[in-house]
């Protein structure tokens, strides 16, 4: 190109279907200058023109020839220049924003603008930057790309954006550019220039404001408080800690507090202060709700179903910020809410659900939500399955005869379809539970009845009920308690009965213990004691309770004694016992000894024993009869532990076991024994018979049968040089070896030559007795040897 | 239990001051801002000012600043207000008032009231 | 400053109805900032609900408070014969903490 020519040809385009082609006017020339400009390819085309661009149609693949000739007062100057796609530019139109808006309380800017894709062709990628900038000193705060798709037609985007700050405390500014990519141009492809921006900024309504107020946020975030005020803000504190301040334009400030802890219930306080006054905010800083846990649904009544759940981690946010619970049945649409006050303990959460007609299947889901989040969690459930019936109520109880009770509750529900396990509890007095279960049909008007027999009579019963469906969920609490004393029915045994002859052998004592109450049937009232002989039978008068003796003369001729025990309803059979004793001239006394609470008796195996044996015990030094109490043992019995209550330690008791055969009763065995033995209580008394130079004899009595507390097993003596009433030892002391003992083992020796003494020396007696159960206490004597002849 | 007692109330003239006194017992004076609020008789409640816990910030309404000084004595559990410059308009019941102990919030209600002192400004 | 004005006047009812007393502030207030207070008579005033809708230590259940932003409700469910007194309400947000000028509740 000559020097004087146009020069500096440039080609852009902003829809690739115009290329706007502009060059520089040759030095010198001014207005009036008139260009031709030839295009060339295969054809040419020229155009006259009065300027220094020309928008052509975008040209197809390849290089063209452009030939521009200017024409002026001076003459003429022409250049050319070789122009294809990869020398053109695409700059998009500078965009405009259709509109920006903010919404305040969420600190979120909305940015409108259109793509005007209809002036565009070619389908085509486009980036988007997008520019937010905070204050009068537009600091840049964001820069996002933002990506879209022209295609062919004007299209509307919208972008959001929250701001860390709240936008009450600065203008905040917006602008846009974009750069397109099209895949089909060879071209430089050049972002747009910046739109004219557009800002939003808030009119105060009052003097002074911190923002933001009552904020929700997740514990650990960041977050920004600021203070828009027409005065100095000296100070920013968060609970009791100083901030340091932010200055934003004017006198506003802000504060920014980093991984924010849990708040209190009430919230985290921040306060501004200026000279004057004071101004303050709150944050809740807390948690979404956690999945509920242990979803549970289960149905009291078939009426109405019960969810319960645990809500978990504790979100800190109550109140209006609390967690709401929304129930939501799938199969039937139907939903049920809670909002509550959110306390800050684990305890479980409950929603009521109306049971649907016809409707056995729930498909349950538990929406939980607060301001930070929501979570769910559903359950399916049979509720025919889940049935935790309320505790049974009005538990009554009536008789049905002696041995059987009807007992009745009630138990609010509708239960016509299904069957119910209930578990009754029985417990008499001083006797194990027993638990008895029975399957009745579920019922809708909630009033149930069962029998139960297999009862004592006369007996106090303590009864309880809890109830369970048959498609076992949970027992139900257990009903009150509810005692009842079955009804009276005749005495099922007659007493057990023991005679004895009087001392003088001419009246019969008849004995008889009270019947235990389980046979007993009712309170015995009083007894009817007959004796019979093959000649007659004779009834004495009634005995009445608690009389448990009568005496009958009679001679020594063979007697059937019965006793019958009457109650209100009737008279227990007769128990009979033979009044004659058959003799045994072969009895010998035993010695036995017990085990400490009772004593062990054993007998060899008599066929001729037909009916019963009979242990009848006393104490020794009690007078005839002896009698204190016996025990009947069947006849198959080779042995028999005795205890009873009124056994002590160190008494002597006889025991005598009978033998029944042919209604007549024959003494067996006589024994003495103790149940435990203990040492003798006393010494025994001894004294000196005789005294020679060279030995004493002794001579001592028997300790009574009181004071042994034992069975006699000996007699232990003592003797060593011993003067009374001086420092010298005596016999017992240890250490002596100088003294002697003798063992007496022989019970029946009642005296004691001790020999081989010195004369005239003073000598040191003692004597104890000693049992199984130890020695006894001692008893000592000075004696002096008498002087050598 | 937590009281509040005033006193230093009375009849006093136009422009001359007077100081209100008030004890507090039952509770950690030093752990809780204070406040004096006033009653025209037979009129509604007016905030007068606040102290901070420790002493270290005070506020007014705006009709008493620069008049009315509030200030505490932490040892002797005491709170005062100083009223210089008083106005017929200043007649009023006072009460001093504990703010609700709120975690750690510098900014809560009142829970605990004295049965207030009468100032009577008259010529 | 915060105004804060109070409706109905005086309010005339009888033990056992339900009253409802408003406040309503000049500009918004934050719900955590909102007091109700009772005073009878020659009695100094008794904090009842705080945070807009927490009852104060020993304020029984009947009393109960709600609301947000400008408008705020203190509702008593059933009129004892001790709640007839006058009641204020209060912003304790920003300086000077300011009170409404009292609803008078009376007996019909």
């Known amino acids: 190109q000559k020097k004087g020519a146009p020069h500096d040809l440039k080609c852009v385009t902003n829809n690739l279907q115009v290329w706007n082609c502009s060059w520089k006017a040759p030095s010198g020339t001014g207005r009036g200058t008139d260009y031709e400009v030839c295009i060339e390819n295969r054809s040419r085309s020229c155009y006259q023109l009065e300027k220094t661009s020309i928008k052509i149609p975008a040209l197809s693949h390849g290089d063209y020839e452009i030939t521009i000739n200017s024409l002026h007062d001076f003459g003429s100057s022409t250049s050319k220049f070789t122009l294809n796609e990869q020398n053109v530019s695409l700059i998009p139109d500078t965009p405009e924003i259709l509109n920006l808006s903010a919404d305040f309380s969420t600190s979120t800017l909305y940015l409108k603008w259109n793509d005007r894709g209809s002036v565009f062709p070619h389908r085509s990628n486009v980036i988007w930057e997008i520019k937010v900038l905070r204050k009068e000193s537009m600091e840049l705060v964001k820069l996002v790309t933002h990506n879209t798709t022209l295609n062919g037609k004007d299209t509307l985007h919208h972008w959001s954006w929250a701001s860390d700050m709240p936008l009450e405390c600065a203008i905040h500014f917006v602008e846009i550019r974009c750069y397109i990519d099209n895949l089909h141009f060879s071209g430089l492809e050049e972002w747009s220039d910046w739109s004219p921006v557009k800002n939003i900024s808030w009119i105060p309504d009052s003097q002074t404001k911190v923002f933001p107020q009552d904020k929700v946020i997740l514990v650990g975030s960041d977050i920004t408080f600021c203070c828009v005020s027409q005065e100095k803000v000296l100070s920013a504190l968060i609970g009791h800690t100083n901030c340091p301040l932010i200055h934003l334009d004017g006198e506003n400030v802000a504060i920014k507090i980093r991984n924010i802890s849990v708040s209190a219930s009430s919230g985290t306080n921040v306060v501004f202060t200026t000279e004057d006054n004071i101004f303050g905010t709150v944050i809740f800083a807390g948690y979404p709700p956690d999945t509920p846990q242990q979803l549970n649904c289960e149905t009291h009544d078939l009426k109405e179903i019960i969810c319960s759940w645990n809500p978990g981690r504790v979100t800190a946010l109550v109140g209006p910020r609390a967690t709401s619970y929304t129930l939501v049945e799938s199969f039937s649409g139907k939903y049920v809410r809670l909002k509550r006050a959110e306390a800050p303990t684990n305890e479980s959460y409950q929603l009521l659900f109306q049971m649907l007609p016809n409707q056995e299947i729930y498909n349950f889901t538990l929406n939980a939500h607060n301001p930070l989040g929501r979570s769910q969690s559903t359950i399916l459930v049979n509720i025919t399955e889940k049935v935790y019936p309320h505790t049974p109520t009005s538990f009554k109880v009536k008789d049905i005869n002696s041995t059987a009770v009807k007992l009745s509750w009630h138990l609010p529900g509708n239960f016509a379809k299904i069957n119910f396990l209930c578990e009754i509890e029985i417990k008499k007095s001083n006797s194990v539970q027993e638990q008895r279960n029975v399957t009745i049909k579920g019922v809708e008007n909630s009033s149930y009845l069962v029998a139960l027999d297999k009862l004592n009579p006369y007996t106090l019963y303590t009864f309880r009920i809890r109830c369970s469906t048959e498609t076992f969920w949970k027992w139900s609490k257990w009903s009150n308690k509810k005692q009842h004393l079955t009804t009276e029915a005749s005495p099922s045994k007659g007493p057990d009965t023991w005679r004895e002859w009087s001392s003088d052998g001419k009246n019969l004592i008849i004995y008889w213990k009270p019947l235990p109450i389980n046979e007993a049937n009712g309170k015995i009232l009083s007894y009817n004691v007959s004796c019979s002989s093959d000649e007659e039978t004779q009834s004495l008068s009634e005995i009445p309770d608690p009389q448990h003796k009568a005496e009958i003369r009679l001679d020594k001729n063979d007697y059937i004694i019965s006793v019958v025990a009457k109650n209100s309803v009737g008279s227990s059979p007769p128990s009979k016992i033979a009044s004659m004793e058959i003799p045994n001239d072969d009895l010998k006394i035993e010695q036995v000894v017990g085990m400490g609470k009772g004593i062990l008796l054993t007998w060899h195996y008599d066929p001729n024993m037909t009916c019963d044996y009979v242990i009848k015990w006393c104490n020794s030094s009690r007078s005839e009869p002896c009698l204190m109490d016996w025990r009947k043992v069947p006849s198959n019995s080779t042995e028999t532990v005795i205890e009873s209550d009124e056994f002590r330690p160190g008494i002597r008791y006889n025991f005598f076991l009978y033998g029944c055969r042919n209604q007549g009763y024959q003494l067996l065995r006589s024994m003495i024994g103790y149940i435990e033995e203990l040492a003798p209580i006393v010494a025994p008394n001894f004294t000196v018979e005789d005294t020679s130079a060279d030995s004493i004899l002794v001579k001592w009595e028997d300790i009574p049968v009181e004071e042994l507390r034992g069975f006699l097993r000996g007699y232990l003596f003592y003797f060593g040089k011993g003067e009374r009433d001086t420092s010298k030892m005596r016999v017992l002391e240890s250490g002596r070896s100088d003294i002697k003992v003798k063992n007496i083992t022989d019970i029946s020796q009642k005296t004691l030559r001790i020999a081989d003494l010195q004369g005239k020396t003073s000598y040191h007696l003692v004597l104890r007795a000693y049992t199984d159960g130890g020695v006894g206490p001692e008893k000592s004597m000075y004696v002096v040897t008498k002087e050598n002849s | 239990q937590v009281q509040l007692v005033e006193s230093g109330g009375g009849v006093v003239q136009p422009g001359r001051s007077l100081r209100l006194s008030c004890a507090a017992s039952?509770?950690?004076?030093?752990?809780?801002?204070m406040h004096w609020v006033r009653q025209a008789p037979g009129k509604g409640l007016e905030w007068v000012a606040v102290?901070?816990?420790?002493?270290?910030?005070?506020y007014y309404e705006d009709s008493v600043k620069g008049r009315f000084t509030i200030s505490r004595d932490n040892s002797k559990n005491t709170l005062y207000l100083q009223m210089n410059s008083l106005r017929a308009e200043d007649t009023a019941v006072y009460y001093c008032?504990?703010?609700?102990?709120?975690?750690?919030?510098?900014?809560?209600?009142?829970?605990?009231w004295g049965q207030g002192t009468l100032v009577t400004v008259s010529s | 400053e915060i105004v804060l004005t109070q409706s109905p006047g005086p309010l005339s009812l009888s033990p056992g109805e339900r009253a409802t007393l408003s406040c309503r502030a000049s500009?918004?207030?934050?719900?955590?900032?909102l007091a109700w207070y009772q005073q009878k008579p020659g009695q100094a005033p008794r904090l009842l609900i705080y945070?807009?809708?927490s009852r104060a230590t020993g304020i029984p259940d009947r009393f109960s408070g709600s609301g947000s932003g400008t408008d705020f409700t203190l509702t008593i469910s059933r009129l004892e014969p001790e709640d007839f007194a006058v009641y204020y309400c209060?912003?304790?947000?920003?300086?000077?903490?300011?009170f409404g000028p009292g609803t008078k509740v009376g007996i019909k």
């Open positions: 008032a504990r703010e609700l102990r709120y975690f750690d919030w510098l900014l809560s209600p009142f829970d605990y």
């Open positions: 039952g509770f950690t004076f030093s752990s809780y801002g």
């Open positions: 102290i901070w816990y420790d002493g270290s910030n005070k």
């Open positions: 500009q918004s207030v934050s719900s955590s900032f």
């Open positions: 945070g807009t809708s």
């Open positions: 209060q912003q304790y947000g920003s300086s000077p903490f300011t």
